[in-house]
């Protein structure tokens, strides 16, 4: 079935949704190792079977991963080399996706209540968004087909809803800084005590300042994960989930928690 | 472990500004804040003012506000308290202590301020 | 400002014995379950030193005769046995909000 698709001129949302489920072995949202080689293999195969040449970004694309061991491309980078019907492909190429802070700015205005989640009708809203923004309009028919689509495919969970960090995986593998944090995330008890202990003057919220120390002694512990150097964009990128300058708990929990106990 | 090392005792006119100093070493100063506090003979501590190293923001005890300022050289690892259009009240002991949480662990062994004609 | 009490303003302990000295503050001091209550020591000519952080945690490099307990308002700092290094002006302090504010002090004396 997905070498049926990958011979395919124009692959629809859904058709595209099955290709990633083939290659996407373990369910970890991303391609990697031997899933990435398996990915090129087929796809170089089916194209020569319906006698279609690599498109540019296919070739640019194997000539970039084909002999590399460490390759890792996320749901974005495959839509970019996949002939993916347009208006789904926009979602992945909008402005909003294009830098961590502008994300991270998106998520603020949906997330509204601080839940640390996007739920269907949310999604369906920030989809729509998107789509105008690009100056695309889709019937609601197709916007629940592609809420949908984004559900199963960034749900890992599947509680139905999208989490900060399943919501990130619209940006780019390179850009997506929230991968840094995935190893270095505390337990519910270690946060609390972070938070509080960070918030010098016991206002309930941190700011730039204390949100700067503790990222300087986070990249201090965490040498491997972390670098320093990008201490700037870090904050900046945080920062873009604060309101006006207040970084609640329920906000830097969503990079720094990993869960309950 | 950090130290902090303030600069020596001062004699100054009422009126005249002053500029303490406080040396830090072996802890990340970057990382920390720096308190300032107020010590009268016979008489407790007051919290002056406390700067975020990082940045050089500052955070003061409205009671203070106008009378010291407080700033960082991080090239050196210094903090500086300027205080301003002394009067006799402000004679005292002031401390400079580091905060990297909610706590003062490391304090400077204090600098004694005299105001007087 | 929340204000500290102390007592006793001061406290002559004989060697060996237990010293126990209370701090109430005007109002909680307590949030998510910490308690930003601190406990110094002073002694002449000397910079304070951080015995106490968060009402009850021994600063490394303190003995552990030392001790702190309390939430909310009412703070208490143990010294048991006394001995005679410990003789002191011992302040307590919160973190709560703004301003940081100290007890007015108790000091030791060793009979």
């Known amino acids: 079935m997905a070498e049926s698709h990958l011979q395919s001129s124009l692959i629809t949302a859904s058709q595209f949704f099955e290709i990633w489920l083939h290659f996407d072995a373990d369910g970890s949202g991303y391609l990697e190792g031997k899933e990435l080689q398996n990915l090129i293999q087929e796809l170089q195969q089916a194209r020569k079977k319906a006698g279609l040449e690599l498109s540019p970004e296919m070739k640019t694309f194997v000539d970039q991963y084909g002999q590399r061991d460490d390759g890792k491309i996320g749901i974005v980078e495959l839509a970019h080399v996949l002939p993916t019907e347009e208006n789904f492909l926009l979602l992945f190429r909008c402005q909003q996706l294009k830098s961590c802070e502008e994300f991270m700015k998106t998520w603020r205005k949906y997330d509204t209540d601080h839940s640390g989640f996007i739920e269907t009708e949310e999604l369906k809203n920030f989809l729509k968004d998107l789509l105008e923004k690009a100056n695309k309009t889709v019937d609601d028919t197709k916007l629940a087909e592609y809420t949908d689509l984004m559900l199963k495919l960034f749900d890992s969970n599947n509680d139905g809803k999208l989490e900060l960090t399943e919501m990130a995986r619209l940006l780019p593998v390179q850009e997506n800084f929230l991968l840094k944090f995935q190893g270095i995330k505390m337990c519910g008890k270690e946060f609390n005590k972070a938070f509080e202990l960070y918030d010098q003057d016991g206002n309930g919220y941190i700011d730039e300042n204390e949100l700067d120390a503790l990222l300087k002694d986070l990249c201090e512990k965490n040498k491997q994960d972390l670098d320093i150097n990008n201490i700037t964009t870090y904050k900046k990128n945080i920062m873009a989930l604060s309101d006006g300058g207040k970084l609640y708990r329920t906000d830097l929990a969503l990079i720094l928690c990993a869960g309950d106990n | 472990q950090g130290q902090m090392q303030q600069s020596g005792a001062e004699l100054v006119k009422p009126g005249a500004s002053v500029k303490l100093s406080c040396k830090t070493s072996?802890?990340?100063?970057?990382?920390?804040?720096i308190s300032w506090l107020k010590q009268k003979p016979g008489q407790s501590l007051e919290w002056i003012a406390w700067?975020?190293?990082?940045?050089?923001?500052?955070n003061y005890n409205q009671k203070f506000t106008g009378k010291a300022q407080l700033t960082v050289d991080t090239s050196s690892s210094t903090a500086y308290m300027q205080f301003s259009s002394l009067t006799a009240e402000d004679s005292a002991i002031y401390y400079c202590a580091r905060h990297k949480y909610r706590y003062l662990d490391y304090w400077g062994q204090g600098t004694t301020l005299t105001v007087s004609s | 400002d929340i204000v500290l009490t102390q007592s006793p303003a001061s406290l002559p302990v004989s060697l060996g014995q237990r010293a126990t000295i209370s701090c109430r503050a005007s109002k909680s001091v307590s949030t998510s379950g910490y308690s930003y209550m601190h406990w110094y020591q002073h002694k002449p000519g000397q910079p304070p030193k951080l015995l106490i952080y968060?009402?009850?945690n021994l600063e490394s490099g303190v003995p552990a005769r030392f001790s702190g307990s309390g939430s909310g308002t009412d703070f208490t700092l143990n010294i048991h046995p006394v001995e005679e290094e410990d003789a002191a002006t011992y302040y307590c302090?919160?973190?709560?909000?703004?301003?940081?504010?100290f007890g007015g002090g108790t000091k030791l004396e060793i009979k």
């Open positions: 302090q919160h973190t709560r909000e703004l301003p940081w504010t």
């Open positions: 700067i975020y190293a990082g940045t050089g923001d500052t």
């Open positions: 072996g802890f990340t100063f970057s990382s920390s804040y």
């Open positions: 968060l009402a009850s």
